[in-house]
Each structure stands twice: as C-alpha cells, then as structure tokens.
C-alpha cells in the first residue's frame, strides 16, 4: 500500500482526525512553536495553545510520565505535535485507519535526517518507559501512566538510535529521510516561515511522484 492510496487530493489538505479543521486556511493567532503555520494551517489557535501545555486536554497525554522531561527535549515533542495538528502539506502520507479517535493518520512521512538526529540528541538523557507511545499505556487515571513492569529508563534505553525514536515512537508515522533540510525532498519539523513553508514543495514533489506511479500502475493493468 503506497502512502496516500486512499485519497486523490494530496495537496493542501487536512487529515480527518480529532482536532483538525476540515480545510486549511490562515490562522493569525497560532501560538509559539506552531506560529510558522500561521499563513495556512489545519489547526486552530486554541488547539495550538492547548498543545503547548503539559498534559493538554487534546489527548490527556503526559510527556512527564517518567519525571520532568528536559525542556530541550520537550520542544521537539511540541514541534512534532504542531506539525501533526497544523500541517496542510502531509497529504501524500495520509492513510485511512479504523480508530475510535480518528479516521486517518500519517504513515512514513519522510522527516529530514537532521531533524530526527537533533530530536534524538536533545532527548536521549530524558526518561520514558516505552518504545511505542501509541499503545500499551495505563489510562485508568484518565492520563497515560507507565504500565505495570515498564521501568523508567533513559530515552536511549528505549530508543537506542535516532531511527528508533523517529520511526518507532508513533508507529511509523515518520521515516527518516536520506535527504537533508532544504533539499525539497524531506519534511522539516522546524522551519522559518519568513522564507515560506518548505514543506509545500516537498508535498508537491511526492504527490507528483505518486501520480506518475499511479499512472504506471494503470498502464500496466491495461496491458495485462
């Protein structure tokens, strides 16, 4: 299943999930780390404010489940959430899912290798108790807690490499790209919006590649 197989509209789209707008558009008051998406966003100002809070009401997810997460680490998780909630440029990687809280997810978004490396470097001394944060938590209190028998250890114990963090954390929502920031071939979690959103070009490139592949598939079936 190629990414984006479930959609024909791959550009300038919002995912069908818990807090996303139905269509992207300007949001002048996006908060702090989400502000780069002001000109065109899938998140509202209130979502952007809420996701900066510890244990925000968006998902009741506690970053500090193994003691206080280092601020240098936490900023990457906030940025990751901004990208997830706000980006209108991830259409090529949207997949349909049958989950109670969302109908779509991202799969294998090609994250620029430097963004992954820096995320891992800034977090490997913080602590966690799990290598996949989508499943297996104890939610009985309404907030994620470490399940019985899951020991709090350094991130490096659970995510020994940058790829283990970026690809394993959210069940392969990201894959680590071979490309670098500024190449136009990988998604940047961090960017300066003064130069525009570099992820627009990336989405256009992969959407075009997917249309070519789809065309080849049709051509192949027609002749066989």
């Amino acid at each position: 299943a190629d990414p984006g197989q479930d959609r024909t509209d791959l550009l300038n789209v919002c995912m069908d999930a818990k807090h996303h707008k139905t269509k992207p558009g300007p949001e002048d008051k996006l908060h702090d780390q989400c502000s780069p998406w002001k000109k065109n966003a899938c998140c509202t100002a209130s979502t952007s404010q809420e996701l900066h809070k510890d244990t925000s009401r968006l998902y009741n997810f506690n970053w500090d489940h193994c003691g206080k997460m280092e601020p240098a680490c936490k900023r990457h998780f906030i940025q990751d959430t901004c990208l997830y909630e706000c980006s209108p440029n991830l259409g090529p990687w949207i997949q349909q899912v049958n989950q109670s809280w969302r109908k779509e997810r991202f799969l294998d978004v090609p994250l620029c290798k430097e963004d992954c490396q820096r995320w891992w470097e800034d977090c490997h001394t913080s602590h966690t108790c799990k290598s996949n944060w989508h499943r297996g938590w104890d939610w009985t209190s309404g907030v994620n807690k470490c399940p019985a028998g899951a020991l709090c250890r350094t991130f490096e114990s659970y995510f020994p490499t940058p790829a283990a963090l970026c690809e394993g954390l959210w069940s392969h929502s990201y894959k680590v790209s071979n490309y670098s920031r500024g190449s136009g071939r990988c998604i940047q979690m961090w960017f300066d919006s003064a130069q525009g959103n570099p992820n627009e070009e990336v989405a256009r490139f992969y959407a075009a590649a997917m249309h070519v592949n789809a065309g080849e598939m049709l051509h192949h079936h027609h002749h066989h």
Epitope: P160, T161, P162, A163, A164, K175
Partner: antibody, heavy 118, light 109 residues
Framework: EVQLVQSGAEVKKPGASVKVSCKAS????????MHWVRQAPGQRLEWMGW????????KYSQKFQGRVTITRDTSASTAYMELSSLRSEDTAVYYC???????????WGQGTLVTVSS | SSELTQDPAVSVALGQTVRITCQGD??????ANWYQQKPGQAPVLVIY???NLPSGIPDRFSGSSSGNTASLTITGAQAADEADYYC???????????FGGGTKLTVLG
C-alpha cells in the same frame, strides 16, 4: 538505493573464529541500528545481537553472549560480526539487517554462508 | 517467556484467504513484524509495526493483532506467496528481538 553487501562464504575449523562484514550504502549509517541474524540449514531465523551504529553500543542474545562481538566502522559504513569458538552447529547463513525500530528489519544483506567442518 | 509460537505449516487453495498467527507474551506490549522467505533468499519484510505494508508489497497482505496474538492475512493467495513466513517482535526487557519458529505456507492448485 539502500544496499547491504556482505563478505563472501567462509569455511572454518572447529574452535576457530570468523568475522563477517556488512557494507551499508544509500542511507545515513549512524542513524540506524544493525542487527545480525543467522539461519542454520532448514532451521528458523535466530537473532544474535545488534549494534547502535551511531555510538557503538551493543546488545547480544544470551545464547551467543561471550562468543559474539559486533563492531562497526562509521568511516566505511560497515558493520562486523565476529563469532569465536566455532562448532559444527554454527554452520549457517549469517545475515545483517537494518532495523527501523526494534525488530522491523527493512533491508537485509544477501547472507554469508559459514561452514564449520573438521 | 520471550517465545513466539507459530504453526509449522499451513496450506491454502489458490485465490483463497489464509491467516498465519504468531503468539507470545511480548506481543501484548510490542508490535509484530512479518517476513516472507523463499528458498535460498534473504527474508523480505512484508508487514511492520503490526499492520503497515512496506512499499512494493501487494495489498493482499495485511496484519492485525489481538491480545498476545498477531496475525498475517493473505487475501486471494497467489502461487508466488508460497514461502516460509516468520514473525518477530521486540522483547521489552533487555531490548532483545525474538523470532517465531516460522510457518511454511503451501498454495494448492
């Protein structure tokens, strides 16, 4: 294009050691872990251990602890697996495999046959 | 225990649906991955992270999980699907990996 190319077949005597190499290309070597898996003739896949290509940390299966050493040379984007005190039961095909996150091996080497015979 | 248990052999009629299972305690908290291996070849990843399909793998392959059991389903089995199938999973304690014993799939007809 991601590729893992392993060294050629080896024939060894019992008690000797063997060192198999795995040259990676087409990706940033230090961002991933490299694992080693073996398969004796007609048998199941058997996990041996892995190395964090970034910092060199290793973890070994208890079965091979003390006999296996996994190393890497980042300048050559190459991982190595050395198995010592060889016995006939170590006759197998040895594979290196790139790990995207704890056991998801998306690329494998072509395999290296190691034959242990007196 | 860190064992993963698979049925040694399963057969399916050409074009029919077959399910291969993998059972083990580690699957309660970790996703399974599935590999296809044909004689004389290296394994090929066909499902990762429980249900994700690598590019190039036909979408007749799918993965699912319930409790301590992971399943690989092939809908409309083809002759080319005849192979050995292995599951694997991370073992949380000690960051080890364990493989199942493998299932030999025969496609009849």
């Amino acid at each position: 294009e991601v590729q893992l190319v392993q060294s050629g077949a080896e024939v060894k005597k019992p008690g000797a050691s063997v060192k198999v190499s795995c040259k990676a290309s087409g990706y940033t070597f230090t961002i991933y872990a490299m694992h080693w898996v073996r398969q004796a003739p007609g048998q199941r896949l058997e996990w041996m251990g892995w190395i964090n290509a970034g910092n060199g940390n290793t973890k070994y299966s208890q079965k091979f602890q003390g006999r296996v050493t996994i190393t890497r040379d980042t300048s050559a984007s190459t991982a190595y697996m050395e198995l010592s005190s060889l016995r006939s039961e170590d006759t197998a095909v040895y594979y290196c495999a790139r790990d995207i996150s704890y056991g998801s091996f998306d690329y494998w080497g072509q395999g290296t046959l190691v034959t242990v015979s007196s | 225990s860190s064992e993963l248990t698979q049925d040694p052999a399963v057969s399916v009629a050409l074009g029919q649906t077959v399910r291969i299972t993998c059972q083990g305690d580690s699957l309660r908290s970790n996703y399974a991955n599935w590999y296809q291996q044909k004689p004389g070849q290296a394994p090929v990843l066909v499902i990762y992270g429980q249900f994700n399909l690598p590019s190039g793998i036909p979408d007749r392959f799918s993965g699912s999980s319930s409790g301590n059991t992971a399943s690989l389903t092939i809908t409309g089995a083809q002759a080319a699907d005849e192979a050995d199938y292995y599951c694997d999973s991370r073992v949380s304690t000690g960051n080890h990996v364990v493989f199942g014993g493998g299932t030999k799939l025969t496609v009849l007809g």
